[in-house]
Interface confidence: low
Amino acid sequence: QNCSGPCRCPDEPAPRCPAGVSLVLDGCGCCRVCAKQLGELCTERDPCDPHKGLFCHFGSPANRKIGVCTAKDGAPCIFGGTVYRSGESFQSSCKYQCTCLDGAVGCMPLCSMDVRLPSPDCPFPRRVKLPGKCCEEWVCDEPKDQTVVGPALAAYRLEDTFGPDPTMIRANCLVQTTEWSACSKTCGMGISTRVTNDNASCRLEKQSRLCMVRPCEADLEENIKKGKKCIRTPKISKPIKFELSGCTSMKTYRAKFCGVCTDGRCCTPHRTTTLPVEFKCPDGEVMKKNMMFIKTCACHYNCPGDNDIFESLYYRKMYGDMA
């Protein structure tokens, strides 16, 4: 909508907004619309909720068409019913250290996420929860048959992760980057965010990327073979173009999407990477947005809405991202 022209308000009366969502005037001061919420895509026509201190963050000047609703600098966070100040770090449980930054919470695991392969002194490693201990620990089962030790050693590799990666310490800055959050939409285009200080000034900043776990129109259950319960990564049928608020990706992509599980488990991205995607809008404007691309998916029981607010949140995050 061109704000210099007459107002164009297609609906009378105003739309009804979900509970907790403000009814606001659009960016042209013309039409009443439901305000976009934290992490949602926004445009001049789709403003962010001002009553929650949100603004439309467009990123680079070249992307002034579509942004992401972001909390103003210094906005607090509400996490697990507690309000935290921006910049404040807290332990959500014994397993996670979290930081609030301008309304967004980023968390890092305190427990080692290492993979332990067989070694001469521990040919059969197994992770167990020990009484009185927060983190699961590796224990070594005695082999029932000593002859299997030899083949097991072929895979021996030391993977201790007890301290920060030395490559992540630079110029008096301990670089910390949280995992990417789960995609804001279970189907269709959504947003994923993370918090990092991996920048020249070592300052915490929020990063966001577009994400699509699966297209909404795909009827994935049809593809599950008889007797099977899950299709983790359906075969890519054909190259597609991504759509974003009326703008179309300039290239086609042979993207992987996550499938579905019929046994009550959730199927979410497990390993992902982030790549820039250029979108061309109807008026000819081109904008570049970072987007998540899925490498592998995993089926698990830590579904959105599970009881442990953080466990379900964390295990839905993306691992192994190369961006």
């Epitope: 007459p6 107002c7 308000c9 297609p10 009378e12 009366p13 619309v33 759509e243």
Partner: antibody
Framework: QVQLKQSGPGLVQPSQSLSITCTVS????????VHWIRQSPGKGLEWLGV???????DYNAAFMSRLSITKDNSRSHVFFKMTSLQTDDSAIYYC????????WGQGTTLTVSS | QAVVTQESALTTSPGGTVILTCRSS?????????ANWVQEKPDHLFTGLIG???NRAPGVPVRFSGSLIGDKAALTITGAQAEDDAMYFC?????????FGGGTKVTVL
């Protein structure tokens, strides 16, 4: 009660123009916009354009060059004019009130034929 | 120009519930598409049911409700009646123009 009444010709020759007047009652043209839509067997419902309550207009890009919508608020008239008619413009033309297209005119059946 | 897609036909029984959907070819339908639903009865009698995604037009029975389901707009008829046997069109707004869907014929058997 809210009503939209259309008046206009039924038969027009190719290359000629179509003019329809939509007279509204029960509401003000300064409060609601008025849309124009046509229905033809081959194409279903086609949105043609709108004149908004404040006088601005928007048109279907496919008809932009030959469509004009104006209004007279005081007389509660909305005027629709389409030029350079061809046989495939034969259809039923409707005016409808903005706000969910809640009220429609009775329709003007147009046949473009020589 | 965007293409708006609807189911061609749906059948329900009296008292049943039927959900009609409206999909946009250029991405998810949002509140900014101001989804409208229009009913057509025989003899080209049109009535607007829903405007602005979920606002019922004056005099429209409460059994008609509009919403967004996933990336589509939806019209739900809860407790269908014989007089709901009709053609239903959705229309989506794209910043400067509306596009109508092809319509869904609802049969109440």
């Amino acid at each position: 009660q809210v009503q939209l009444k259309q008046s206009g010709p039924g038969l027009v020759q190719p290359s000629q123009s179509l003019s329809i007047t939509c007279t509204v009652s029960g509401f003000s043209l300064t409060t609601f916009g008025v849309h124009w839509i046509r229905q033809s067997p081959g194409k279903g419902l086609e949105w043609l354009g709108v004149i908004w309550r404040r006088g601005g207009t928007d048109y279907n890009a496919a008809f932009m060059s030959r469509l004009s919508i104006t209004k007279d608020n005081s007389r509660s008239h909305v005027f629709f004019k389409m030029t350079s008619l061809q046989t495939d413009d034969s259809a039923i033309y409707y005016c409808a009130r903005d706000g969910g297209f809640d009220y429609w005119g009775q329709g003007t059946t147009l046949t473009v034929s020589s | 120009q965007a293409v708006v897609t609807q189911e061609s036909a749906l059948t329900t029984s009296p008292g049943g519930t039927v959900i009609l959907t409206c999909r946009s070819s250029i991405g998810a339908v949002t509140t900014s598409n101001y989804a409208n639903w229009v009913q057509e009865k025989p003899d080209h009698l049109f009535t607007g049911l829903i405007g602005g995604t979920s606002n019922r037009a004056p005099g429209v029975p409460v059994r008609f409700s509009g919403s967004l389901i996933g990336d589509k707009a939806a019209l739900t008829i809860t407790g269908a009646q014989a007089e709901d046997d009709a053609m239903y069109f959705c229309a989506l707004w794209y910043s400067t123009h509306y596009v109508f869907g092809g319509g869904t014929k609802v049969t109440v058997l």
